[in-house]
């Protein structure tokens, strides 16, 4: 027994206790002072005296005590048959319980887990499912990267047969560079030799230049002579043209007295036999108004009338719209015609324009127009030009469709400047356009750089200015 | 329409400095040399600087070369001259030209130096 404990109560009995787990039990026993004498023959129903009997000496004390505790003894054992007894039935009982409630206990846990086992399960299969999805899906990427990896290997097994063509043909290029470079060195070689067999020869030829210079200065001299003897001879002829006139005249009606012969243009004084180069009286038909011309009877068959004449920077060209109208300087020289008298010339017939033109080192050009006319000066004397040839540029330097005729203080031009005031000059402006052969006259070494001179641009470009200009028009079908 | 429109010109002191500038429209700018040119009261035009269609190269008059600089801006369709150090003879208006057939010119824009 887990615990046995023995107190005294309030009335003098003997209280016992026993603990056995969480029961606990009680028992109530009379004292044994008073007991029957081992001697005496024990009766179960006999009744317990209140009060002891007292004995004097210590052996019948001892046999007293004797009884007691063989009493006492007896007591405890019955007690203990009795727990015994009692607690065989309990512990049977508390078994029963234990089993009972631990089944009920086991069979909820074993519930739990079923439904726990269930929702794994289905859990589980949720997961499976998205497992299968998912290698599905990877299944199906890998096979998509598959092929796109046979692609590319294909591309680049493509790429590289590429390559190995290009550098092929590279490698074919850079040898054939390298001949080229060859060949270009000796070409090089060859053109040096060439340039120095050049040079010899300029200095040559300018030896003989300097001597043929000589040799012109004295046949101008000689020339100047000659004309001298020319003029005299020609006034010679005069005198006694006059003297025969005067005496066939009652023989010869045909030839009036003062009769003078008038000429349109230098075509028709070439016509009319006068085949020298020279300053000509010109009179439209239908007027009496004359102007001088100066007329070209050598170049390309002759019989061309000047309008225009650029050689020295001796006369002013930036001119009112009038003075351009009536035109100005000198015939021999440098002049303007005069827009009235070519507006009026062209419109009469088809005329061809030639404009010539030579630069400061010494070259020619020319721009030919096989149709040209001028509108009246209501239509401010407006530039028509057809069919450019000649080498002085393939497209015209004058702009085409024609521009209208301005100077400094008539601006007819395209542009938000004043053409005629800034590049000086009358001329048929446009924006301000690729020429004007009235502009400033400069002089070599001065004549580049400049954007008011004398300027042809499809020939010598924007800043070049002219060494002469001269520009000279004829009928179409001389 | 082709325009050239210059700006950037006024009074200044002699030794200050200014920036012209010349917007260009209706051609091809980037296909032409351009050039300042300049027109003093009373006188005649005068070469100022050109430079190439790409700006690769510049060209000055002797009586700038050092002062002036010019350059171009093809993506801007714009050309420039800046001036420094100027003197009163600087005194003129300034045109920008295109080297095209055409020849195209501005208005033009003034520049004094004067104290």
């Known amino acids: 027994y887990n615990n046995f404990r023995k107190s005294m109560d309030s009335i003098g009995k003997k209280q016992y206790q026993v603990q056995h787990g969480s029961c606990s039990y009680t028992f109530l026993l009379p004292e044994m002072d008073n007991c029957r004498s081992s001697s005496s023959p024990y009766v179960s129903n006999a009744v317990q005296r209140d009060a002891p009997l007292e004995y004097d000496d210590s052996v019948q004390r001892l046999q007293v005590l004797e009884n007691i505790m063989e009493n006492n003894t007896q007591w405890l054992m019955k007690l203990e048959n009795y727990i015994q007894d009692n607690m065989k039935k309990e512990m049977v009982e508390i078994q029963q319980n234990a089993v009972q409630n631990q089944t009920a206990v086991m069979i909820e846990i074993g519930t739990n887990l079923l439904n726990q086992t269930a929702e794994q399960t289905r859990k589980l299969t949720d997961v499976e499912a998205q497992v299968l999805n998912q290698t599905t899906r990877l299944e199906l990427q890998l096979l998509e990267h598959s092929l796109s990896t046979n692609k590319l290997e294909k591309q680049i097994l493509d790429q590289t047969s590429e390559i190995n063509k290009l550098q092929d043909k590279n490698s074919f290029l850079e040898k054939k560079v390298l001949a080229m470079e060859d060949k270009h060195i000796i070409q090089l070689q060859s053109i040096k030799e060439e340039k120095d067999q050049l040079q010899v020869l300029v200095s040559k030829q300018n030896s003989i230049i300097e001597e043929l210079e000589k040799k012109i200065v004295t046949a101008t001299v000689n020339n100047s002579v000659l004309q001298k003897q020319q003029h005299d001879l020609m006034e010679t002829v005069n005198n006694l043209l006059t003297m025969m006139s005067t005496s066939n005249s009652a023989k010869d009606p045909t030839v009036a007295k003062g009769e003078q012969i008038s000429f349109r243009d230098c075509a028709e004084v070439f016509k009319s036999g006068h085949t020298t180069n020279g300053v000509y009286t010109l009179t439209l038909p239908n007027s009496t108004e004359e102007v001088k011309a100066y007329c070209d009877m050598e170049a390309g068959g002759g019989g061309w009338t000047i309008i225009q004449r650029r050689e020295d920077g001796s006369v002013d060209f930036q001119r009112t719209w009038k003075e351009y109208k009536v035109g100005f300087g000198n015939p021999s020289g440098e002049y303007w015609l005069g827009n009235e008298f070519v507006s009026q010339l062209t419109n009469q017939q088809r005329y061809v324009l030639k404009i010539h033109l030579k630069d400061w080192e010494g070259n020619e050009a020319y721009s030919l127009y096989e149709h040209f006319y001028l509108s009246s000066e209501e239509l401010n004397y407006r530039i028509h030009l057809k069919g450019l040839t000649g080498t002085a540029g393939k497209i015209s330097s004058i702009s085409q469709p024609g521009n209208d005729f301005s100077t400094k203080d008539a601006d007819n031009d395209k542009c938000i400047c004043k053409c005629s005031q800034m590049l000086t000059g009358g001329w048929w402006f446009d924006a301000c356009g690729p020429s004007n052969l009235n502009g400033m006259y400069y002089p070599q070494r001065q004549n580049t750089n400049k954007f008011n001179g004398i300027k042809w641009y499809y020939w010598k470009g924007s800043g070049y200015s002219l060494k002469g200009t001269t520009m000279m028009i004829r009928p179409a079908g001389f | 329409e082709v325009q050239l429109v210059e700006s950037g010109g006024g009074l200044v002191q002699p030794g200050g400095s200014l920036r012209l500038s010349c917007a260009a429209s209706?051609?091809?700018?980037?296909?032409?040399?351009m050039s300042w040119v300049r027109q003093a009261p009373g006188k005649g035009l005068e070469w100022v600087s050109s430079?190439?269609?790409?700006?690769?190269?510049?060209y000055y008059a002797d009586s700038v070369k050092g002062r002036f600089t010019i350059s171009r801006d093809n993506s801007k369709n714009t050309l420039y001259l800046q001036m420094n150090s100027l003197k009163p003879e600087d005194t003129a208006v300034y045109y920008c030209?295109?080297?095209?057939?055409?020849?195209?010119w501005g208005q033009g824009t003034t520049v004094t130096v004067s104290s």
């Open positions: 030209n295109a080297d095209h057939p055409q020849g195209y």
């Open positions: 209706g051609f091809t700018f980037s296909d032409f040399g």
């Open positions: 430079i190439t269609w790409s700006g690769g190269s510049t």
